[in-house]
């Protein structure tokens, strides 16, 4: 559910939403840390209806949700995927 990617791509998100999405409608969450061509952290949410949305990392609900998912990750979720692209 929770994936962290380190890439050398530029920013993926053109616009961001802060509108709440319940967990049950979320397929997975991608976190793209700042750096490597993008000056900001990006969060991409893949929804159960196959649509994708960029979420404002400052949105309270996504911060809370990621904290819950991190706490669960050791026992109930796959280990987050870390990918570093070789320059």
């Amino acid at each position: 559910v929770l994936e962290v990617y380190y890439t050398s791509l530029r920013c993926r998100c053109v616009q961001e939403s802060s509108v709440f999405i319940p967990r049950r409608f979320i397929d997975r969450i991608q976190i793209l840390p700042r750096g490597n061509g993008c000056p900001r952290k990006e969060i991409i949410v893949w929804k159960k209806n196959k649509s994708i949305v960029c979420v404002d990392p400052q949105a309270e609900w996504i911060q809370r949700m990621m904290e819950v998912l991190r706490k669960r990750s050791s026992s109930t979720l796959p280990v987050p995927v870390f990918k570093r692209k070789i320059p």
Epitope: V19, P22, R24, F25, K47, K48, R72
Partner: antibody, heavy 121, light 106 residues
Framework: EVQLVESGGGLVQPGGSLRLSCAAS????????MAWVRQAPGKGLEWVAS????????YYRDSVKGRFTISRDNAKNSLYLQMNSLRAEDTAVYYC??????????????WGQGTLVTVSS | DIQMTQSPSSLSASVGDRVTITCKAS??????LTWYQQKPGKAPKRLIY???ILQTGVPSRFSGSGSGTEFTLTISSLQPEDFATYYC????????FGQGTKLEIK
């Protein structure tokens, strides 16, 4: 007091169409995700579809995808379910439900009385 | 898709009995489970949400427990108005209801 009142049910032939409505009152309608749940005669409950606050996001069970469309009109405090290509197995009481929600914790706390849809020739 | 297996499908009991209904999820749903009571011709009524939080106005004889894949609804001392059908609902990934448990008077 939260109230949900469904309407639009009735008898329809296989392949036909029907549009259900749900009138909401007693709460700020646009603050909630909403859902349709159905129950075939003598059977259990089955989630059909959900819609987000502004109607921009919709979700369906596999068996109704491409045939049913959930929508809402926040100005009218109304939820809709357009049902096309109806089949005998769609026969059920259809309930409108409010998805009280934050972080996925509370769900379907308020329900309407239901409206019966019968698909038969 | 997550499947919910509810048992028993029917249950006969007497007023004053302690009754337990079980719901098993096909995968981990943490505590994202709700219990409903439904009487004939009526809409479902939410009893318990988040596995063990009692809905306001629901008598304390109802309680819920569990986590992960196994959940229980317990009625500590059956009252005449408790004879109904009970459903569990997982809300971890979309929605899936259990098949229901019909609680009848013995």
């Amino acid at each position: 007091e939260v109230q949900l009142v469904e309407s639009g049910g009735g008898l329809v032939q296989p392949g036909g169409s029907l549009r259900l409505s749900c009138a909401a009152s007693g709460f700020t309608f646009s603050d909630y995700y909403m859902a349709w749940v159905r129950q075939a005669p003598g059977k259990g409950l089955e989630w059909v579809a959900s819609i987000n606050y502004d109607g921009g996001d919709t979700y369906y069970r596999d068996s109704v995808k491409g045939r049913f469309t959930i929508s809402r009109d926040n100005a009218k405090n109304s939820l809709y379910l357009q049902m096309n290509s109806l089949r005998a197995e769609d026969t059920a009481v259809y309930y409108c439900a409010r998805e009280e929600d934050y972080d996925g914790s509370y769900v379907m706390d308020a329900w309407g009385q239901g409206t019966l849809v019968t698909v038969s020739s | 898709d997550i499947q919910m297996t509810q048992s028993p499908s029917s249950l006969s009991a007497s007023v004053g009995d302690r009754v337990t209904i079980t719901c098993k999820a096909s995968q981990n749903i943490n505590k994202e489970l709700t219990w409903y009571q439904q009487k004939p011709g009526k809409a479902p009524k939410r009893l318990i949400y988040n596995t063990n939080i009692l809905q306001t106005g629901v008598p304390s004889r109802f309680s819920g427990s569990g986590s992960g894949t196994e959940f229980t609804l317990t009625i500590s001392s059956l009252q005449p108005e408790d004879f109904a059908t009970y459903y569990c609902l997982q809300q971890s990934s979309l929605y899936t209801f259990g098949q229901g448990t019909k609680l009848e008077i013995k």
